[in-house]
Interface confidence: low
């Protein structure tokens, strides 16, 4: 599918909150969504309130991803599941990398070969099934001010 409008990314200093973002997945055109009950999936409706995400830099190149409405943090579990926890743990930090195609990838800092990814059905993809070069791991950060 064609890319939606208004991309834009870039590193930011530790501790600094940028404006809320929507993370648009290149695979199927889904926005990463964090539900209040901790479920994580993708949705195409850019008006969905649960796709508004706050990215905070823990250190250079490492971010946490918080669902603004859910008030939960994206976490990669040891079995590869993606869920959102109420508290920040060591499973809630991801290496943010700007790829050559201007999409970002988010790789787990704890489980270092696993990426945040969405399947083309909108379901999240198990971390253990992800890897470099997959379309499912590519995300375009978009403004979510509106």
């Amino acid at each position: 599918p064609a890319l939606p409008e208004d991309g834009g990314s870039g590193a930011f200093p530790p501790g600094h909150f940028k404006d809320p973002k929507r993370l648009y997945c290149k695979n199927g055109g889904f926005f990463l969504r964090i539900h209040p009950d901790g479920r994580v999936d993708g949705v195409r409706e850019k008006s969905d309130p649960h796709i508004k995400l706050q990215l905070q830099a823990e250190e250079r190149g490492v971010v946490s991803i918080k669902g603004v409405c859910a008030n939960r943090y994206l976490a990669m579990k040891e079995d590869g599941r993606l869920l959102a926890s109420k508290c920040v743990t060591d499973e809630c930090f991801f290496f943010e990398r700007l790829e050559s195609n201007n999409y970002n990838t988010y790789r787990s800092r704890k489980y270092t070969s696993w990426y945040v990814a969405l399947k083309r059905t909108g379901q999240y993809k198990l971390g253990s099934k992800t890897g470099p070069g997959q379309k499912a791991i590519l995300f375009l950060p978009m403004s979510a001010k509106s």
Epitope: R120, G122, K129, K135
Partner: antibody
Amino acid sequence: QVQLQESGGGLVQPGGSLRLSCAASGFTFSSYEMNWVRQAPGKCLEWVSYISSSGSTIYYADSVKGRFTISRDNAKNSLYLQMNSLRAEDTAVYYCARELTGDWGAFDIWGQGTMVTVSS
Amino acid sequence: QSVLTQPASVSGSPGQSITISCTGTSSDVGGYNYVSWYQQHPGKAPKLMIYDVSNRPSGVSNRFSGSKSGNTASLTISGLQAEDEADYYCSSYTSSSTVVFGCGTKLTVL
């Protein structure tokens, strides 16, 4: 056992329509992504269409886009392919195929196929 | 959608090893580790032999193996047996969320 059974093929004139069905058994149909793949006589395999487990996400090959419609009825364990504006080049054996869980483009269960012939 | 490139035919004697290549682009084979291989006997439906480049489904002989380098995937069959004689097709997921197949390679066991 795990099985897919296509039906609905036959002879149709150019410009005509046909609806193929695929009955699934032996597995939880509603949990699987499904596809249609076709093979013209003596020719290559050609992927035709994909539908997600819920039916909310659909993809088509460029060659059939706007003419074919994939759908499913999870309550009936059935997959469908509505084919309109048929052309001679649509003549092929049509297979329904189950997509391997958690994977893309790997089809682990296939039906035996149903023949569609488009000719005047 | 373009078709993946496979040799039209290969042959080998029983006990030998053969390799079938499958060449695509960076938008399919080269871009993803979602390459599959299928075996098809005349008049039968295809059978999945390899998925995710190199994984074998349960029940498939370990004589079948897959690999990939750049935009080219390969299927290797070792210890050729008469029943391996069939058409072999590769496929790949693509950047447009579709699937593309090769046109098949006819394997003859001499």
